[in-house]
Interface confidence: medium
């Protein structure tokens, strides 16, 4: 039910600079490339991470077991809930962490139902389909590189490439393509 091929196409020209471990501290990206993505913080998949983590209980804990992927929607329970919880094509957020990407953390939406929830019964109906809404996002991807021209990766050295990826930001309810 996930589409693993969320990666887009690399958009890099020429040979990117090969940064040593000293030039770039772990987890950081080159400032001139960061400038190209100055609005990263405003992108929903990036902004959501900090709000989700701020609301979290920090550190794992026992939590209720959900007995089914597609929830039963009860109006009285969701009046105060967020959009992704009140939707008839509800979704959850998965915080995706990739050390070789900047931003390292992105919030991916995952539809909880194959169908949609019937507003009258609160239960899933197969007469409608939940589909993901995708947003194109520019990210930086780091790759090992050689600083001595030998072609062999230099330990701790990385080059950065820009790349567009498609990030699911939510789900919506649609009519099936065929009945």
């Amino acid at each position: 039910h996930h589409d693993p091929s969320l990666r887009g196409h690399p958009h890099s020209h020429g040979t990117p600079h090969c940064y040593s471990a000293e030039e770039l501290p772990l987890g950081q990206a080159p400032p001139h490339l960061l400038a190209r993505g100055a609005k990263w913080g405003q992108a929903l998949p990036v902004a959501l991470v900090s709000s989700l983590e701020a609301a979290s209980h920090r550190g794992r804990h026992e939590r209720p077991s959900a007995t089914t992927q597609c929830p039963v929607l009860r109006p009285e329970e969701v009046l105060e809930a967020d959009t992704h919880q009140r939707s008839i094509s509800p979704w959850r957020y998965r915080v995706d962490t990739d050390e070789d990407r900047y931003p390292q953390k992105l919030a991916f939406a995952e539809c909880l139902c194959r169908g949609c929830i019937d507003a009258r019964t609160g239960r899933e109906t197969a007469a409608l389909n939940s589909v993901r809404l995708l947003q194109s996002l520019l990210v930086l991807r780091r790759r090992p590189c050689s600083r001595d021209g030998s072609g062999l990766p230099t330990p701790g050295a990385f080059a950065f490439h820009t790349e567009f990826i498609h990030v699911p930001v939510g789900c919506t309810c649609v009519l099936p393509r065929s009945v």
Epitope: H1, H2, D3, P4, L26, G27, L52, E53, A55, S56, H57, R58, G59, R60, H61, E62, R63, P64, S65, A66, T67, T68, Q69, P71, A81, H84, Q85, P90, R92, Y93, R94, V95, D96, T97, E99, E110, L112, G156
Partner: antibody, heavy 128, light 110 residues
Framework: QVQLVQSGAEVKKPGSSVKVSCKAS????????ISWVRQAPGQGLEWMGT????????YYAQKFQGRVTITADESTSTAYMELSSLRSEDTAVYYC?????????????????????WGQGTLVTVSS | DIALTQPASVSGSPGQSITISCTGT?????????VNWYQQHPGKAPKLMIY???YRPSGVSNRFSGSKSGNTASLTISGLQAEDEADYYC??????????FGGGTKLTVL
């Protein structure tokens, strides 16, 4: 670039304890949890417990509760697993693994662990 | 604790596709818990092949794919190669933060 290097093989007597170390390099030690997984000869993988240095918390499998102690020394980026009251059934290869938690959010948080980097394994033989 | 059930063995010829299943219950695999898959060659440490049901770590061949339907997660290997012969384990985390592995599946490339 992340590497987990474990201590060498051990031969122990029944009733004694063993302490295996796991030194991490190439990443931020406190950013990730370290789990210990064992594998008896010809058997499957069995999770023993996890330490989360950032939150200072440890989680143990019920089977090993009271017998296993997992600790971490952030200054040396090393995690340790000590198993006491050893018996012959504890003969196994013990692995440390970096534990990345995927967290998903609906009405609650749901934690899922995955082990993306593993140590080379430490064979512990318990024999009289 | 949850129990994840895998077939003990699976076999296929080079170039073929094979699927390994991992069955749980509606409160774990069929609920909000993710499933990960590992490959282990004899005498070696396990290697993460698929995480969070269907995502591939960088460096893992796109011949490996994961999916989940109901209470069953599946690992599919297409274009089978000799080096794919290994043990494969599924793994998940239950609601009490207990990590559980399937019993393992031995893949034989004929």
């Amino acid at each position: 670039q992340v590497q987990l290097v474990q201590s060498g093989a051990e031969v122990k007597k029944p009733g004694s304890s063993v302490k295996v170390s796991c030194k991490a390099s190439g990443g931020t030690f406190s950013s990730y949890a370290i789990s210990w997984v064992r594998q008896a000869p010809g058997q499957g993988l069995e999770w023993m417990g996890t330490i989360d240095p950032f939150f200072g918390k440890t989680y143990y499998a019920q089977k090993f509760q009271g017998r296993v102690t997992i600790t971490a020394d952030e200054s040396t980026s090393t995690a340790y697993m000590e198993l006491s009251s050893l018996r012959s059934e504890d003969t196994a290869v013990y692995y440390c693994a970096r534990d990345v938690s995927s967290i998903s959010y609906y009405f609650h948080e749901y934690y899922s662990d995955r082990f993306d980097y593993w140590g080379q394994g430490t064979l512990v033989t318990v024999s009289s | 604790d949850i129990a994840l059930t895998q077939p003990a063995s699976v076999s296929g010829s080079p170039g073929q596709s094979i699927t390994i299943s991992c069955t749980g219950t509606s409160s774990d695999v069929g609920g909000y818990e993710y499933v990960n898959w590992y490959q282990q060659h004899p005498g070696k440490a396990p290697k993460l092949m698929i995480y969070d049901d269907s995502y591939r770590p960088s460096g893992v061949s796109n011949r490996f794919s994961g999916s989940k339907s109901g209470n069953t997660a599946s690992l599919t290997i297409s274009g089978l190669q000799a080096e794919d012969e290994a043990d494969y384990y599924c793994q998940s985390t239950d609601p009490h933060s207990t990590v559980v592995f399937g019993g393992g599946t031995k893949l034989t490339v004929l």
